[in-house]
């Protein structure tokens, strides 16, 4: 996790910085939301547990043509050790529950804020 989020800087970014930047991006999405986010697209809900970064990416990568979450998708890929492609699903998905992208982002943001406040970056 030491090479996360190198979009803004040339060198490796500490995990705490990468997580903070992801949180701030999710805040931006939430605050700047005028119309329904991603036209109200629905994504699989996930269990916010150990492998949630990959699970979150697997869910969001299935949303296409939504520029508002492209940066989030890129940032999440930095937290996920394996390559994720559309249509891929892990056991962390709650496969019977779909929620709007806006709700997904809100839930993810809250969970990441809690982790960050408690100093849990990995």
């Amino acid at each position: 996790l030491t090479c996360l989020g190198g979009f803004a800087s040339p060198g490796p970014v500490p995990p705490s910085t990468a997580l903070r930047e992801l949180i701030e991006e999710l805040v931006n999405i939430t605050q700047n939301q005028k119309a329904p986010l991603c036209n109200g697209s629905m994504v699989w809900s996930i269990n916010l547990t150990a492998g949630m970064y990959c699970a979150a990416l697997e869910s969001l990568i299935n949303v296409s043509g939504c520029s508002a979450i492209e940066k989030t998708q890129r940032m999440l890929s930095g937290f996920c050790p394996h390559k994720v492609s559309a249509g891929q699903f892990s056991s962390l998905h709650v496969r019977d529950t779909k929620i709007e992208v806006a709700q997904f982002v809100k839930d993810l943001l809250l969970h990441l804020k809690k982790l960050f406040r408690e100093g849990q970056f990995n």
């Epitope: 903070r20 805040v27 939430t30 605050q31 809250l110 804020k113 100093g119």
Partner: antibody, heavy 120, light 107 residues
Framework: QVQLKESGPGLVQPSQTLSLTCTVS????????VQWVRQPPGKGLEWMGV???????SFNSVLKSRLSISRDTSKSQVFLKMSSLQTEDTATYYC??????????????WGQGVMVTVSS | DIQMTQSPHSLSASLGETVSIECLAS??????LAWYQQKPGKSPQLLIY???RLQDGVPSRFSGSGSGTQFSLKISNMQPEDEGVYYC?????????FGSGTKLELK
Amino acid sequence: QVQLKESGPGLVQPSQTLSLTCTVSGFSLTNYHVQWVRQPPGKGLEWMGVMWSDGDTSFNSVLKSRLSISRDTSKSQVFLKMSSLQTEDTATYYCARDGTIAAMDYFDYWGQGVMVTVSS
Amino acid sequence: DIQMTQSPHSLSASLGETVSIECLASEDISNYLAWYQQKPGKSPQLLIYHTSRLQDGVPSRFSGSGSGTQFSLKISNMQPEDEGVYYCQQGYRFPLTFGSGTKLELK
């Protein structure tokens, strides 16, 4: 408009448990986090803990063993319980709304506070 | 825990004067800093969050700056209603912590 109001006993015996209620209006507990802060007479502010909008809680580690926070969303109330009170727990206890849609945690609306004295 | 050190402990200013209050964090808190004003017998009121964002209804004579570990609150054109105790607060890491306060009085 947004309002928070603390209620509870003004006097608690040493070693007893303090129970406080924060009743809110003008916002939903499922959309905003509620924080607890206390202030001993003539002293500074100390963060105690938070009731997150999803019902989870986080606490100041120095108080964690004595503290619990719960809520009743249907009544728009958040409850704080603190056990084994000592004289140094004498303070004004505040509940406050968290700014929430921000990367940082801050307190944008405060209750008027309830003064709690621990004495026999 | 992140320690927040405020200075000065107290100061007095004349009407119309500009005053500054400093806040030093014991470690990097990015821009996750808020400022509050508290008047005697009242609850604190939010002035500024995220270092420099003014809370709704707060006069523009209040401004905040800084990043990392060093922050300041500036009050230009001191008014009688600006008397009170000012606290900084870090919202970066639990436990959330406050500065010890700066008492501002009118000369």
